[in-house]
């Protein structure tokens, strides 16, 4: 499956929108930084077959979509930017789902690398737990926004590597 160029552009647009969503100066939030232990090895496209890499990407985008679709998220961010961001993620999910279906028939290995998917889910659980512990404070959301920008950047790099493999 060739991920369309629009998918990559969508990812960049999502990153730009996320960058614009900040409501308070991050400079006041340095002490709120937290180690969410991003599973960087899951974004290393070299160790996966294509179907597995796409599954990881899909899980990453799905979890990001879920995180920003909560009531707490709606209260934290400017509504029109949040809606545009969610729309970009939704479009990416559609692209990836089409690819997942296509790749199942191509590769004989199991579609989902369960360990990798689990690692991504646990990563988002840590993010959610952090927000709960910090009572969804503005700084907590700023830290999470920065972290998601970082993980989306990893996703973008993984997509680039996938395209180079084609």
């Amino acid at each position: 499956c060739d991920l369309p160029q629009t998918h990559s552009l969508g990812n960049r647009r999502a990153l730009i929108l996320l960058g614009q969503m900040g409501r308070i100066s991050p400079f006041s939030c340095l002490k709120d930084r937290h180690d969410f232990r991003i599973p960087q090895e899951e974004f290393d496209g070299n160790q996966f077959q294509k179907a597995q890499a796409i599954s990881v990407l899909h899980e990453m985008i799905q979890q990001t979509f879920n995180l920003f679709s909560t009531e707490d998220s709606s209260a934290a961010w400017e509504q029109s930017l949040l809606e545009k961001f969610s729309t970009e993620l939704y479009q990416q999910l559609n692209d990836l789902e089409a690819c997942v279906i296509q790749e199942v028939g191509v590769e004989e290995t199991p579609l989902m690398n369960e360990d990798s998917i689990l690692a991504v889910r646990k990563y988002f659980q840590r993010i959610t737990l952090y927000l709960i512990e910090r009572k969804y404070s503005p700084c907590a959301w700023e830290v999470v926004r920065a972290e998601i920008m970082r993980s989306l950047s990893f996703s973008t790099n993984l997509q680039k590597r996938l395209r180079r493999k084609d």
Partner: antibody, heavy 121, light 107 residues
């Protein structure tokens, strides 16, 4: 390869203006903040201020507030430090360094080579 | 502002010695502390971040410890290239602040 390349040494007279630069390459310039640090001859490191190039949000150390201006042009991945009226006491080496912002990553992991500013009549 | 106080301000040591430099913050900074090495005419180089994390490419003889207000940089076996000035820096709250530096000289 990540690099921060600063503009060359400057010799100025008191009262003159100056703008020095720091160009980032090898990474996403808007994903990191840029900090400026002063080192007067034979002295220690002093943090001057920091800028988020993505939106030019800037903060200064109280010691440098009103004395210098920090700016950035993200289209050319460059941050700036400027003075409108230099004093002899501004003679120092000035360093830029990148900061990961709110990400859990090393602070000031890459530094420019430094710009030596000499102010003398 | 958070004040950072390093001790000693200078020390003399021999190659192979174990060297310890301390840094004290005027208030708790959790583990938001970095250590830098600077050689004459060169830019500072990050050694340790978040109090105890070794920066990529830095030899394992360097280690950091501490949390809250008291921190330590240890060089387990001093090498000739380690003679330099070392600075701590807090990144807990703006304004960011550095210690005054510790110069490690050859005995």
């Amino acid at each position: 390869e990540v690099q921060l390349v600063q503009s060359g040494a400057e010799v100025k007279k008191p009262g003159e203006s100056l703008k020095i630069s720091c160009k980032g390459s090898g990474y996403s310039f808007t994903s990191y903040w840029i900090g400026w640090v002063r080192q007067m001859p034979g002295k220690g490191l002093e943090w001057m201020g920091i800028i988020d190039p993505s939106d030019s949000d800037t903060r200064y150390s109280p010691s440098f507030q009103g004395q210098v201006t920090i700016s950035a042009d993200k289209s050319i991945s460059t941050a700036y430090l400027q003075w409108s009226s230099l004093k002899a006491s501004d003679t120092a080496m000035y360093y830029c360094a990148r900061h990961p912002g709110l990400a859990w990553a090393p602070d000031f992991d890459y530094w420019g080579q430094g710009t030596l500013v000499t102010v003398s009549s | 502002d958070i004040q950072m106080t390093q001790s000693p301000s200078s020390l003399s040591a021999s190659v192979g010695d174990r060297v310890t430099i301390t840094c004290r913050a005027s208030q708790s900074i959790d583990d938001f502390l970095n250590w830098y090495q600077q050689k004459p005419g060169k830019a500072p180089k990050l050694l340790i971040y978040f109090a105890s994390s070794l920066q990529s490419g830095v030899p394992s003889r360097f280690s950091g410890s501490g949390s809250g207000t008291d921190f330590t940089l240890t060089i387990s076996s001093l090498q000739p290239e380690d003679f330099a000035t070392y600075y701590c820096q807090q990144s807990h709250t703006l304004p960011l602040t550095f210690g005054q530096g510790t110069k490690v000289e050859i005995k």
